[in-house]
Interface confidence: medium
């Protein structure tokens, strides 16, 4: 004799009893009415299962909750199924067996026929696991059922602090969707909140799970696929205050079927969004967007933000949204990088884009901007990176495209190519009134518009000029004069420089900022406009430093231990971290602080010039870093503002030194012998380079490095030209992760050292 191998299969679900009604007492597990009714309903469920062929496998069951409408019973039951039959008893098959029994004319005296009028249509059976039951049981001491009426915003009572886990069981009208809003009220906690597309905490129906007081998403809204949701809270550490506020609404299903015809222009024409964006998209999302282009000269570009698409094997589900575009199946995934999907138009002038959630697990709503591109020249003057669909500068010495193809097959890299014989000359020699090319082609077209390219400056009227770095040089190079606008910047207040010294003089670096918390210098920064200071994003990554309210910004400061008449201080009204900032890699390490009132410029307080995206800082150029950082690795911060000259290092060499961890948003400076470098406390401070015009331009922000001043390891700075578009967007009110959104890891509170 050999014992038959069985496996415990757990099913969860609900059924409606048409001849009973929900009462408030049934919503409270501790009430006598609940205990009595749940025992009877559990017996009814047991009898129902037992009267089918599943009866021989029956192990146990429980009715753990009741809901509104005709009385809805929420239950689970366990069957011990022979191993060989496991796959044949799917939730669908089990439901069918139970529905057949409910519809049968058998003359049983079981309560599901005599006492309870069970609605076969309303029977829901879902697959569950033993672990789901364990989680459910752990919440039963703090189990809250709420029915959400339409038009009502229902605040949910906070978790019971005596328990370690609570469950909110939410139900609304059948034709509506449940939408939960979660707002973290504290900056640090270790609580976990999980939301399920079911009445109970079924792992296979998990929509999202968040841990800790999430600074990435201080407020989040989450949609269920229908009228039921479960929210489970697990305590992280003891606290007298609720770490979050929960509220819930029942909302109508929003359609996302769109037909659009685009106009024959190349700028952004609109956006497509998942329903209730920026809410998490629902597990039942199915969007179909049909876009028509005006002619086959154009292709369609979809511009994503922190989300990208990639091909996936057909047998693999997309976990963050499935996209069908021109019969291509693509999976979405979250990324801290920009991405564009380019759709070439070949035979038809229309394309249908389908977005579907394939699993219950969802994510933040997806928004995609759309525009047209010229199919014959998708990236005028630049290189189309096929990996991410972006137009990137070509042959500038920086591998912008992950596969490096933008720097392949270059006749001249980070240099000007003479038209006569393809000789390469350095960029500062272009349009300098001295011919260097054989026939002087480097000095031609210097007074007129030229096709835009990697090193051409784009004027406000979108025309381009050949002269490198024409901004604020005292000569009007653009027809519209835009290269000489916004030039109240980059001039030193006083020129008494200590030659070869390390201590700065008053007014020498009038843009230098000291960012402080409770009188302690934490990071450097630079004034870039009358209400804006730029710094490094990693200065704010500690939970205790994330709030703008904590910070004071000092400008015109010389010494940390004393105040003098030339210095002014400001509170911070808003903090913007770059939305792609990633602490582990230090990528996009830039933040903007909006000051509480405008700065009045003086000899000791004035902004540095911001470079254009095309501004070329030449490797080998001597530039300066300033700050109150430590004067030796591990040492204390300096009292007096220090300055040090460093040389800009070619990207390829720096990248090799740091084993290819240097991204295109990074710039290296220093010396191979080390000695001169930034250090702790300098983070976010300016790396500035002086142009021949005498104006100082912001090339970088102190970001990270291996140690301080170590041989073979340069200082790594945020490359301002690669984040300038985001800076301008924030300065002109275009937003970009305001209020302090960031992510959770550890950087040193200032210059990053390993």
């Amino acid at each position: 004799y050999k014992a038959e191998v069985t496996v415990s299969q757990v099913y969860s679900g609900s059924l409606r009893v048409l001849n009973r009604h929900f009462s408030q007492d049934l919503g409270r597990r501790e009430s006598i009415a609940f205990r009595s009714e749940s025992a009877k309903a559990q017996k009814m469920l047991q009898e129902l299962v037992a009267s089918t062929r599943l009866g021989t496998y029956y192990n146990s069951s429980s009715v753990y909750s009741f809901g509104e409408g005709p009385l809805t019973c929420f239950f689970w039951f366990i069957l011990d199924i022979p191993e060989y039959q496991r796959l044949t008893l799917s939730p669908e098959v089990v439901r069918e067996l139970l529905v057949d029994e409910l519809l049968s004319n058998s003359s049983t005296l079981a309560s599901y026929k005599t006492e309870y009028e069970v609605d076969p249509e309303g029977l829901v059976i879902l697959e569950a696991s033993v672990n789901d039951i364990v989680v459910l049981n752990s919440t039963l001491g703090c189990y809250r059922y709420s029915y959400v009426n339409p038009g009502q915003v229902l605040p949910l009572k906070g978790p019971d602090q005596q328990t370690t886990s609570c469950l909110w069981h939410l139900q609304g009208p059948e034709d509506l969707m449940i939408k939960v809003r979660l707002e973290w009220t504290r900056v640090d906690c270790r609580d976990r909140v999980a939301m399920y597309d079911a009445a109970g905490p079924l792992e296979k129906r998990l929509i999202t799970s968040v841990y800790g007081c999430s600074r990435q998403e201080p407020v989040m809204e989450v949609l269920a696929s229908g009228s039921v949701m479960a929210v489970v809270w697990k305590k992280g550490m003891h606290s007298y205050y609720d770490p979050f506020l929960l509220s819930v609404k029942s909302v109508a299903f929003q359609d996302c079927q769109v037909n659009l015809t685009l106009e024959g222009r190349l700028d952004t024409q609109g956006f497509l969004r998942t329903p209730y964006y920026p809410s998490y998209y629902s597990p039942s999302t199915h969007c179909s967007w049909h876009l028509t282009v005006p002619s086959l000269d154009y292709g369609l570009a979809l511009w994503f933000d922190a989300y990208a698409l990639r091909r996936q094997k057909y047998n693999r589900l997309c976990t963050q949204g499935q996209w069908m575009i021109q019969n291509r199946r693509l999976c979405g995934f979250r990324t801290l990088q920009p991405y564009a999907e380019r759709i070439p138009m070949v035979a038809s002038d229309g394309v249908t884009i389908n977005f579907t959630s394939q699993i219950s697990l969802t994510g933040p709503g997806v928004q995609v901007y759309y525009s047209l591109y010229n199919q014959s020249d998708p990236c005028p003057g630049e290189f189309l990176c096929s990996v991410n669909g972006l137009c990137v500068p070509a042959c500038d010495g920086i591998k912008d495209c992950p596969n490096g193809l933008d720097e392949r097959n270059c006749v001249c890299r980070a240099m000007f190519q003479c038209q006569e014989d393809s000789t390469c000359i350095s960029l500062p020699r272009v349009c300098d009134r001295q011919p260097d090319c054989l026939n002087g082609s480097d000095e031609e077209q210097c007074q007129e518009g030229v096709p835009c390219g990697t090193f051409t400056f784009q004027c406000e009227d979108r025309s381009c000029v050949k002269k490198p770095n024409p901004e604020c040089d005292g000569q009007s190079d653009c027809r519209d004069g835009s290269d000489e606008q916004h030039c109240d910047c980059g001039l030193q207040g006083l020129s008494s420089r200590i030659v070869g010294g390390t201590v700065s003089s008053e007014g020498e670096w009038p843009w230098q900022a000291s960012l402080q918390i409770r009188g302690r210098h934490i990071c450097g920064g630079a004034l870039i406009a009358d209400r804006w200071v730029i710094t490094a994003a990693h200065c704010f990554q500690e939970d205790s430093m994330a709030s703008p309210k904590l910070w004071t910004v000092f400008l015109g400061k010389m010494r940390q231990n004393s105040r003098w008449p030339g210095e002014v201080s400001f509170k911070v009204s808003r903090l913007f971290l770059h939305p792609y900032h990633e602490e582990d890699s230090h990528d996009y390490d830039v933040a903007l602080l909006q000051l509480d009132h405008p700065v009045v410029y003086s000899a000791t307080v004035r902004p540095v010039c911001l470079p254009a995206r095309s501004h070329f800082f030449e490797p080998g150029q001597h530039c300066w870093i300033t700050g109150w950082g430590a004067q030796r690795e591990g040492g204390p911060v300096s009292n007096t503002l220090q300055k040090v000259d460093v040389q800009l290092v070619p990207q390829d060499l720096c990248s090799e030194a740091y084993r290819y961890q240097v991204s295109p948003r990074m710039l290296c400076a220093g010396y191979r012998k080390g000695k001169k470098d930034a250090c702790q406390g300098d983070s976010g401070g300016p790396l500035v380079c002086r142009e021949p015009s005498g104006r100082w331009f912001l090339a970088g922000l102190v970001s990270w490095g291996l140690g301080c001043g170590r041989p073979n390891f340069f200082g790594v700075y945020t490359r301002v030209t690669r984040v300038i578009n985001w800076i301008q967007q924030v300065l002109t009110g275009g937003g970009g992760s305001g209020g302090g959104g960031s992510h959770h890891h550890h950087h040193h509170g200032s210059h990053h050292h390993h």
């Epitope: 720097e407 392949r408 097959n409 270059c410 890299r413 980070a414 240099m415 390469c424 080998g620 040389q647 290092v649 070619p650 390829d652 060499l653 720096c654 090799e656 030194a657 010396y671 191979r672 012998k673 041989p711 073979n712 340069f714």
Partner: antibody, heavy 124, light 111 residues
């Protein structure tokens, strides 16, 4: 006067080992990358190895990798090349050369001071 | 790493110009701006004439100039003089701290 002087060359049987030395003077030795370059008589130059000033970055040409070892002693202003498993094709004039002076790049990958060379003849 | 390609010989009369080529790949000459040129007289050690494509060390006459286009670097010697007769070698950085040399060009000053 800035100077590099190689020594240690000679006639050696294939399969045997030899150690070349390079003595530096007239400059701050520990601030420079140093290279070994060889030249087969009547033929071109071949870079074979380089070592950074702190000995933390070392590189070899594929033709000698696993057989030759470069090292330096900054206290003695000396560079060494340990050559094992010598082959007939290693016969050449061996130069040591200094990285171009300057305090900026990781390397310039350019050699501004050369020794006069030491001859290694490997007999088979 | 394979050697850079240089023509075996080149010649010119005194006062004339001669241009020497050095062809590599997109992984060395084509990728990095670290091309050097050396002059070597018979029985002597090489002498650095050009580094980083076009820069001259102090003491090198401005008759020597370097340039680069795609995978090919060039050295131009203008106003050719008798003492310019020598072997000329190019070199390039090839990534991963490796350097590669060319096979050399023998320059003859005619007359």
């Amino acid at each position: 006067e800035v100077q590099l002087v190689e020594s240690g060359g000679g006639l050696i049987q294939a399969g045997r080992s030899l150690r070349l030395s390079c003595a530096a003077s007239g400059f701050t030795f520990d601030e420079h990358v140093i290279y070994w370059v060889r030249q087969i008589p009547g033929k071109g130059l071949e870079w074979i190895s380089s070592i950074s000033w702190k000995s933390d970055i070392i590189a070899y040409a594929d033709s000698v990798k696993g057989r030759f070892t470069i090292s330096r002693d900054n206290a003695k202003n000396a560079l060494y090349l340990q050559m094992n498993s010598l082959r007939a094709e290693d016969t050449a004039l061996y130069y040591c050369a200094r990285e171009k002076d300057g305090d900026f790049y990781y390397y310039y990958f350019a050699m501004d001071v050369w020794g006069q060379g030491t001859t290694v003849t490997v007999s088979s | 790493q394979s050697a850079l390609t240089q023509p075996p010989s080149a010649s010119g009369s005194p006062g004339q110009s001669v241009t020497l080529s050095c062809t590599g790949t997109s992984s060395d000459v084509g990728y990095y701006n670290y091309v050097s040129w050396y002059l070597q007289h018979p029985g002597k050690a090489p002498k650095l004439m050009i580094y980083e494509v076009s820069k001259r060390p102090s003491g090198v006459p401005d008759r020597f100039s370097g340039s680069k286009s795609a995978n090919t670097a060039s050295l131009t010697v203008s106003g050719l003089q008798a003492e310019d007769e020598a072997d000329y070698y190019c070199s390039s950085y090839a990534g991963s701290n490796k350097v590669v040399f060319g096979g050399g060009t023998k320059v003859t000053v005619l007359g």
